[in-house]
Interface confidence: medium
């Protein structure tokens, strides 16, 4: 493994793809969504020390400010670096309609 | 503004574009640029609250999410929605040279 | 595991109706879309339809309407597709499909074979 | 409707060899296709999602390409279990439509 992808505060504890297990009701989806009924939500947990997983030179300068400023300047965070696709059935007025959305899954994660 | 744009915590206490004043020695840098000495550093800073500048469908499952489990999703994070580029001035082994770095400084921000 | 379970080959004669049905197992009948594909013999594959278990909401294909009525029994997690007015062009294998993500068919039945002949 | 068009219609191959079945969308259908592989007497099984995805269960040897309207199904040492019928599938808009197949069989 690359040295950014290395956790220094122990396995599992930085930034990763999680899957979260959630109903239409969860998600606040049930009135305008009708199928899948359950989604496996993947998402970007997870602490992001330095030199973990940076996604650019932007996240580079937010962590060395951070160190010197952590009242100013919060530590990087951990989002998606990209999206998996995924097809939703949705209730319209004249019935139902096929709609993929392509920023709903993440795929992979790092900081920023 | 948009509903997306109007803080609920109060003005200014939303993720937004902040500017931090840094040297080249706060950034790690002094040891390969030379220019500039000194960078207004944007980056994006606040809370995220509900339906705050949501990136897209994902975020907003993640603010569902985190409202049901706050202990195992976190709410989402204040991040770059774009870059400004910036030209740094760097020293090489045969002299110096001119760079363009496309993701160093915060343009604008959402909630991801 | 998820399991689809198809009923047996069915020999009608034309112009009659058929009722194939499709029992699932090894998952919550309701979180998973049922459609239907059908194979003619050394062909293709065509999708019919599909419908959504919780309230029996359906969408077909433009040419099976009126040619296929897709329904679904929670209480027994068996979903149903009839074809009517039957002539030789519906002899074929009908397969159920299961789907999560509902753009593609993650488990298949084994078919059931129709053969439409006097 | 869109129009899935797989060639070639049938494939010769020894095993171990590296083979690229074609599929073609009549528009553009961006990543939204996916790949069967169905034998002899037997139901369809997924093997690629969104052209390009892996799904649990399926060997590494089988990845899809492609984006748009142009797809590849691609097996790089082809087994003899391999051989029987290969299917796209779009799901960018409905109908659902698949390709005519591609027979991947034995030389």
């Known amino acids: 493994a690359r040295n950014g992808d290395r956790c220094p505060l122990g396995p599992g504890r930085c930034c990763r793809l999680h899957t979260v297990h959630a109903s239409l009701e969860d998600l606040g989806w049930a009135d305008w969504v009708l199928s899948p009924r359950e989604v496996q939500v993947t998402m970007c947990i997870g602490a992001c020390p330095s030199q973990f997983r940076e996604a650019n030179m932007h996240a580079q300068i937010k962590m060395n400010l951070h160190r010197l400023k952590p009242d100013t300047v919060p530590a990087p965070c951990c989002v998606p670096a990209s999206y998996n696709p995924m097809v939703l059935i949705q209730k319209t007025d004249t019935g139902v309609s096929l709609q993929t959305y392509d920023d709903l899954l993440a795929k992979d994660c790092h900081c920023v | 503004a948009r509903n997306g744009d109007r803080c609920p915590l109060g003005p200014g206490r939303c993720c937004r574009l902040h500017t931090v004043h840094a040297s080249l020695e706060d950034l790690g840098w002094a040891d390969w640029v030379l220019s500039p000495r000194e960078v207004q550093v944007t980056m994006c800073i606040g809370a995220c609250p509900s339906q705050f500048r949501e990136a897209n469908m994902h975020a907003q499952i993640k603010m569902n999410l985190h409202r049901l489990k706050p202990d195992t999703v976190p709410a989402p994070c204040c991040v770059p929605a774009s870059y400004n580029p910036m030209v740094l001035i760097q020293k090489t082994d045969t002299g110096v040279s001119l760079q363009t770095y496309d993701d160093l400084l915060a343009k604008d921000c959402h909630c991801v | 595991q998820v399991q689809l379970q198809q009923s047996g080959p069915e020999l009608v004669k034309p112009g009659a109706s058929v009722k194939l049905s499709c029992k699932a197992s090894?998952?919550?009948?309701?979180?998973?879309?049922i459609n239907w594909v059908k194979q003619r013999p050394g062909q293709g594959l065509e999708w019919i339809g599909w419908?959504?278990?919780?309230?029996?909401?359906?969408k077909y294909n433009e040419k099976f309407k009126g040619k296929a009525t897709l329904t679904v029994d929670t209480s027994s997690s068996t979903a149903y597709m009839e074809l009517h007015s039957l002539t030789s062009e519906d002899s074929a294998v009908y397969f159920c499909?299961?789907?999560?993500?509902?753009?593609?068919?993650?488990?298949w039945g084994q078919g059931t074979t129709l053969t439409v002949s006097s | 409707d869109i129009v899935l068009t797989q060639s070639p219609a049938t494939l010769s191959v020894t095993p171990g060899d590296r083979v690229s079945l074609s599929c073609r969308a009549s528009?553009?259908?961006?990543?939204?296709l996916h790949w069967y592989q169905q034998k002899s007497h037997e139901s369809p099984r997924l093997l690629i999602k969104?052209?390009?995805q892996s799904i649990s269960g399926i060997p590494s040897r089988f990845s899809g390409s492609g984006s748009g309207t142009d797809f590849t199904l691609s097996i790089n040492s082809v087994e003899t279990e391999d051989f029987g019928m290969y299917f796209c599938?779009?799901?960018?808009?409905?109908?659902?439509?698949f390709g005519g197949g591609t027979k991947l069989e034995i030389k």
């Open positions: 499909a299961g789907t999560y993500d509902p753009a593609y068919f993650d488990y």
């Open positions: 090894g998952y919550t009948f309701t979180s998973y879309d």
């Open positions: 419908i959504y278990p919780r309230d029996g909401i359906s």
């Open positions: 528009q553009s259908i961006s990543y939204y």
């Open positions: 969104y052209a390009s």
């Open positions: 599938q779009q799901s960018n808009s409905w109908p659902y439509t």
